[in-house]
Structure formats: structure tokens, C-alpha cells
């Protein structure tokens, strides 16, 4: 999951590069100063920007909580990727939180699929082939968001 | 934190006007640009005007182009937008969006946005 957040307490370190912007827009990797006239590079490993912007502030890198690993670490132009851990996985309709996979299937049915960091495991029917989705334990540990959602997927 | 509030919605006749306001309560937008995005049921969000905080230079989509009108007040650190001669189709939940994203630097139209407020609902019926 990306979150990110505009951190306008951070401001850019002197040796940081600067550039001009194009038609009032920064690259990624960049933001704008107040004056518009600079584009100024995000901090390796601590901030980022994914697209042309005029942020004042490039974006928080996102810390994966505990009850997640980190796949990707964060670049100047891409965010944290954070996995829910093994053993655990996150559903799109509840983000927000790792659940823990089921440990089997009920009596008469046969798994299909493992527990993945996206998906529970998968159970049929042994008969019939019809999937059976239980309900699922919440891990105590809940993934926190930072407020507003990008528009576009920041990945 | 960036916060973004608006008003000024409401329920209103075929060519009647609204204003929206936008006030960011965090005392910073977090960009130079602020915009104004739509969105009807089922649909995705719409870009509908955008403006440059610094030099006042706006943005309009093409369905919007001579009926809104996007303004700021940097003083009060609101971005406004005057709505005229409204159609039924106007009616959605009308976004105020900062931190705008675009692919391409010469992009008038932004592809998203990092922060977004609430939303503001408009009705037009005929």
C-alpha cells in the first residue's frame, strides 16, 4: 500500500541540485521552491515525487509498520513497498490492515490456493469445485494512512 | 498537514450560479497550483479547472470553459469557483484537489492528486 504526505516542516538542504521548471512543472524526483523558480531534488530514502508537480514539499517516504516487509525501498521518484509479512496478507476492500491466512480448509474441502501477501488461501468443495471464502481473523497490527488519497497509483 | 475544506454546494435551477470556496485549514495548500476535480456516480473524477496561486494563471476543461470562473485569495488562503449558467449535467461532487500530478510537463490537465478534500455536492435540475 503507498501512502504519502506533504511535509511542509522539511525544507530543502543547500547542496540539494536545482534546476529550472518547464511550463511551471518539476520532474519527478523533484519539487518546486515557493518562488517557482527552482526545482529542487527530493531527498534519497527520505522523500519523493512520482510525476511532474509544483509541490512545495516532495512526499514523505512511507515507513512499512511491523507485520510488513519491504520490497522496495523508496527512490527520489518512487515510494516504499511495503508487503504484509508471510503468514499474513492484505485485502484490496480493507487495505488497511494485514489479516492472517487460514491455517486449512474446513472438513470436505481441499485447498487450491496458498496464502499469498495478496490472498487468503483457497478452498473448493471437494465434490462440486465451488470456492468457499471464510471469515478472517485481523492481524492487532493496523497498516496507518496518511490523509488524501492519491488520484493516480504512486508506485 | 495539508487539510482542504469546501462550501458552497447546493441544489439549484438550469442556469442558476454557485460559488465553491476552498480553504486550506493546515495554513499551506503544499503546492503552487490548486484545482477543482468532479465526479457523478459511476464515473471516475473529472478534471474541471485548475489555478496558479503565485501568477493567477487558470486552467479549464473544455465542458466548463466560459461558465467557470477559478480565482484565489492568498490573504485568506481560499481558492474560489464561480459556477454560471449551470446545466443539469454540472450536477456531481465537486473536488477540491492540491498537490496536482501530471505526466508530462506540458500537460494542461492533471492526471491526479495527492490531496483532496471532502467533496461538495451540486444539483442542477431542470
Known amino acids: 500500500i503507498t501512502r504519502q504526505s506533504l511535509d511542509p516542516q522539511r525544507r530543502a538542504a543547500p547542496q540539494q541540485k536545482r534546476s529550472s521548471p518547464t511550463e511551471g512543472l518539476c520532474p519527478p524526483g523533484h519539487h518546486i521552491s515557493e518562488d517557482s523558480r527552482e526545482c529542487i531534488s527530493c531527498k534519497y530514502g527520505q522523500d519523493y515525487s512520482t510525476h511532474w508537480n509544483d509541490f512545495l514539499f516532495c512526499l514523505r517516504c512511507t515507513k512499512c509498520d511491523s507485520g510488513e516487509v519491504e520490497v522496495n525501498s523508496c527512490t527520489t521518484t518512487r515510494n516504499t513497498v511495503c508487503q504484509c509479512e508471510e503468514g499474513t496478507f492484505r485485502e484490496e476492500d480493507s487495505p488497511e490492515i494485514c489479516r492472517k491466512c487460514r491455517t486449512g480448509c474446513p472438513r470436505g474441502m481441499v485447498k487450491v490456493k496458498d496464502c499469498t501477501p495478496w490472498s487468503d488461501i483457497e478452498c473448493v468443495h471437494k465434490e462440486s469445485g465451488t470456492k468457499h471464502t471464510g471469515e478472517v481473523p485481523a492481524v492487532e497490527k493496523t497498516v496507518t494512512t496518511s490523509p488524501g488519497t492519491p488520484a493516480s497509483p504512486c508506485s | 498537514e495539508v487539510q482542504l475544506v469546501e462550501s458552497g454546494g447546493g441544489s439549484v435551477q438550469a442556469g442558476d450560479s454557485l460559488r465553491l470556496s476552498c480553504a486550506a485549514s493546515g495554513r499551506t495548500f503544499g503546492s503552487i497550483r490548486v484545482g477543482w476535480f468532479r465526479q457523478t456516480p459511476g464515473k471516475e473524477r473529472e478534471f474541471v479547472a485548475a489555478i496558479n496561486r503565485n501568477d493567477g494563471t487558470t486552467y479549464y476543461a473544455d465542458s466548463v470553459k466560459g461558465r467557470f470562473t477559478i480565482s484565489r485569495d492568498n490573504a485568506k488562503n481560499t481558492v474560489y469557483m464561480q459556477m454560471a449558467s449551470l446545466k443539469p449535467e454540472d450536477t456531481a461532487v465537486y473536488y477540491c484537489?492540491?498537490?496536482?500530478?501530471?505526466?508530462?510537463?506540458?500537460?494542461?490537465?492533471?492526471?491526479?492528486?495527492?490531496?483532496w478534500g471532502q467533496g461538495t455536492q451540486v444539483t442542477v435540475s431542470s
Open positions: 484537489a492540491a498537490g496536482l500530478q501530471y505526466n508530462r510537463s506540458a500537460d494542461r490537465v492533471p492526471v491526479g492528486a495527492v490531496y
